[in-house]
C-alpha cells in the first residue's frame, strides 16, 4: 500500500475495538483501525498491536505485502494465567508438552491424537476420560437410532493419523515440531502456526501458513443428502482463485474444503499438506505464501469445549501434515 497519497478513511466513524484490542493508526498514519493481534494477518494498512509488543513479520523481503503479527524476539507468553519466558518448556497438563517462543505457545500432545472415523464394528466412536488415566480412550457407543446404520457404512474406513514423532534425533539435535494450530478462521482465509527446530541451526522458530477450512459464502448445509447428517468433504464445483488482502492467487485451485454437520459434530481437516501459493497484487507485485491444502476432513464430536484451556484449542488442530 502506497502511503504517499492523501489520507482518506472509510466513511464510517472510528471502529469500536473488542476489549483488550488497541485502537491505533494504520501504517500510513492515516486511519484509526483495531490493531491486529498475535498470529493474525497484517498489512501496512492493518498494523499489529504495538502495546503488546507485536510487529508485522512479512517473512522474506519479496512478501512485503502481507505478514503475520509476531511478538518481538524474547517476548514472554501468558498461558493459563502463568507467565513463561521465551524458550521455556512446560507441561500445560498431563496431556501436552508446550514451548513458549517469542510470545507464541506451541504444544505437542503426549497422548495419541488419532481421529477415529465410524466403521461397521464401531459406528459411533467417542473419546471418554477413564478414571485414573490421563489420556482419553475411544469407546464405541451403541447407536441410538438403528436406521442410521446400514449399507452406507461400507463407505467408512478407519483412518488414524498421528502428529510427527517428537523424538526424532538428527546430528545432535532433538528435532521437535508442534502440530499446526487450528486455522484462525472457521471460514475464509486464516492462518495456522507451529513451532519447530527442524532447521540447520536447531533453533526454535515459528512457521505460519495460510489456511481455509471452508469458504464463508458456501451454504454447505443445503448439500447434505436426505437422511444424512453431515457433508464431510463437499465437492467444489469449479476451480477457485484464493484472495488475500486484495491480492489474487495466480493459479486456480480445485481445493478440498471441510463440510458441516447438523447433529452437533464439527468437521475439521484430518490430513493436510502445505504448498506455496503465489499471489498477484493490484500493483503487479507477486508474493509467495505457504498455504494449507486439505486432503481429508473428519466429522467428530471432539468439538472445542470450554472445560480445558488447551483442549478447546487442540481438538481443532490439524493432524498428519504431509509437507
Amino acid at each position: 500500500q502506497n502511503c504517499s497519497g492523501p489520507c482518506r478513511c472509510p466513511d464510517e466513524p472510528a471502529p469500536r475495538c473488542p476489549a483488550g484490542v488497541s485502537l491505533v493508526l494504520d501504517g500510513c498514519g492515516c486511519c484509526r483501525v483495531c490493531a491486529k493481534q498475535l498470529g493474525e494477518l497484517c498489512t501496512e494498512r492493518d498494523p499489529c498491536d504495538p502495546h503488546k509488543g507485536l510487529f508485522c513479520d512479512f517473512g522474506s523481503p519479496a512478501n512485503r505485502k502481507i505478514g503475520v503479527c509476531t511478538a518481538k524476539d524474547g517476548a514472554p507468553c501468558i498461558f493459563g494465567g502463568t507467565v513463561y519466558r521465551s524458550g521455556e518448556s512446560f507441561q500445560s497438563s498431563c496431556k501436552y508438552q508446550c514451548t513458549c517462543l517469542d510470545g507464541a505457545v506451541g504444544c505437542m500432545p503426549l497422548c495419541s491424537m488419532d481421529v477415529r472415523l465410524p466403521s461397521p464394528d464401531c459406528p459411533f466412536p467417542r473419546r471418554v476420560k477413564l478414571p485414573g488415566k490421563c489420556c482419553e480412550e475411544w469407546v464405541c457407543d451403541e447407536p441410538k437410532d438403528q436406521t442410521v446404520v446400514g449399507p452406507a457404512l461400507a463407505a467408512y474406513r478407519l483412518e488414524d493419523t498421528f502428529g510427527p514423532d517428537p523424538t526424532m534425533i538428527r546430528a545432535n539435535c532433538l528435532v521437535q515440531t508442534t502440530e499446526w494450530s487450528a486455522c484462525s478462521k472457521t471460514c475464509g482465509m486464516g492462518i495456522s502456526t507451529r513451532v519447530t527446530n527442524d532447521n540447520a541451526s536447531c533453533r526454535l522458530e515459528k512457521q505460519s501458513r495460510l489456511c481455509m477450512v471452508r469458504p464463508c459464502e458456501a451454504d454447505l448445509e443445503e448439500n447434505i443428502k436426505k437422511g444424512k447428517k453431515c457433508i464431510r468433504t463437499p465437492k467444489i464445483s469449479k476451480p477457485i482463485k484464493f484472495e488475500l488482502s486484495g491480492c489474487t492467487s495466480m493459479k486456480t485451485y480445485r481445493a478440498k474444503f471441510c463440510g458441516v454437520c447438523t447433529d452437533g459434530r464439527c468437521c475439521t481437516p484430518h490430513r493436510t499438506t502445505t504448498l506455496p501459493v503465489e499471489f498477484k497484487c493490484p500493483d503487479g507485485e507477486v508474493m509467495k505464501k505457504n498455504m494449507m491444502f486439505i486432503k481429508t476432513c473428519a466429522c467428530h464430536y471432539n468439538c472445542p469445549g470450554d472445560n480445558d484451556i488447551f483442549e478447546s484449542l487442540y481438538y481443532r488442530k490439524m493432524y498428519g501434515d504431509m509437507a
Epitope: 500500500q1 502506497n2 504517499s4 497519497g5 492523501p6 489520507c7 482518506r8 478513511c9 472509510p10 466513511d11 464510517e12 466513524p13 472510528a14 493508526l25 500510513c28 498514519g29 492515516c30 486511519c31 484509526r32
Partner: antibody
Framework: EVQLVESGGGLVQPGGSLRLSCAAS????????MAWVRQAPGKGLEWVAN????????DLLASLKSRFTISRDNAKNSVYLQMNSLRAEDTAVYYC????????????WGAGTTVTVSS | VVMTQTPLSLSVSLGDQASISCKSS???????????LEWYLQKPGQSPQLLIY???SRASGVPDRFSGSGSGTDFTLKISRVEAEDLGVYYC?????????FGQGTKLEIK
C-alpha cells in the same frame, strides 16, 4: 455550535516569522483532521497543509515544506501554522478548516486571518 | 493535478439553470478507488462553504437544487433554479492526489 477561530495574522517583514493559531469548539477535536487553506488577494483558494488526528502525520504543499510547519494540541483544541522565512507571495488570508478525513475534506471553515508580508 | 474550470464567469437570471464544468489534468480516482471531487461556494466577503463532496453527494444543509456529476476527468456542478443567495465564486477541488488542488474559480452573477 461548531466554530473555528483563527488568530496570529498581521504585518511582517520578508524573512520574518509568524505563528497562526486556530481554536476549535463545538465538536470532538481529536476525531478530525485539520487543515490550512490560503487565498491571496483577488486570487483563488490554495491548500497549504493538513494534519491527522494526533499530529503524527502532516502533509504540506511541497513548495512550502521547508518553511511552514503544521501542528496541533488536542488538549487545547487548537491547530497551528508556523511560518518562517516569509515572502511577499505568502501574503494571503489564511483559513483554518476542519477535514473529516472520510467522505469530504473541508466541511467547516474559520473566518480567516490576514497575513501581509511587506517591507 | 491541474483543475480547469469553465466558464470563469457566468451571468444567470433568477430561476434559470446554471452549469459549471471542471476538468482535471489526470484521473482523480484515489488509491481506495473513490473519487474525491468537491465543490465549494465562496459568497462575497465570506469564507468558502462545502456544497458537494465525492462528485455527487450533497453536504448537509445544501439545497437539492445543487447537484454534482461526472467521472474520470470531467465533472459538472448544476444549479437547477438559481436564487439570489447563490451568487459568489464556485471552486472545484480534488483531494485524491497531492498536492490537493482547487480550480481557479467561476464567478456566478445574477442578471
Amino acid at each position: 455550535e461548531v466554530q473555528l477561530v483563527e488568530s496570529g495574522g498581521g504585518l511582517v517583514q520578508p524573512g520574518g516569522s509568524l505563528r497562526l493559531s486556530c481554536a476549535a469548539s463545538g465538536f470532538t477535536f481529536s476525531d478530525y483532521y485539520m487543515a490550512w487553506v490560503r487565498q491571496a488577494p483577488g486570487k483563488g483558494l490554495e491548500w497549504v497543509a493538513n494534519i491527522n488526528y494526533y499530529g503524527s502525520r502532516t502533509d504540506l504543499l511541497a513548495s512550502l515544506k521547508s518553511r511552514f510547519t503544521i501542528s496541533r494540541d488536542n488538549a487545547k483544541n487548537s491547530v497551528y501554522l508556523q511560518m518562517n522565512s516569509l515572502r511577499a507571495e505568502d501574503t494571503a488570508v489564511y483559513y483554518c478548516a476542519r477535514d473529516t478525513s472520510r467522505g469530504s475534506y473541508f466541511d467547516v471553515w474559520g473566518a480567516g486571518t490576514t497575513v501581509t508580508v511587506s517591507s | 493535478v491541474v483543475m480547469t474550470q469553465t466558464p470563469l464567469s457566468l451571468s444567470v437570471s433568477l430561476g434559470d439553470q446554471a452549469s459549471i464544468s471542471c476538468k482535471s489534468s489526470q484521473s482523480i480516482v484515489h488509491y481506495n478507488e473513490k473519487t474525491y471531487l468537491e465543490w465549494y461556494l465562496q459568497k462575497p466577503g465570506q469564507s468558502p462553504q462545502l456544497l458537494i463532496y465525492k462528485v455527487s453527494s450533497r453536504a448537509s444543509g445544501v439545497p437539492d437544487r445543487f447537484s454534482g456529476s461526472g467521472s474520470g476527468t470531467d465533472f459538472t456542478l448544476k444549479i437547477s433554479r438559481v436564487e439570489a443567495e447563490d451568487l459568489g465564486v464556485y471552486y472545484c477541488f480534488q483531494g485524491s492526489h497531492f498536492p490537493l488542488t482547487f480550480g481557479q474559480g467561476t464567478k456566478l452573477e445574477i442578471k
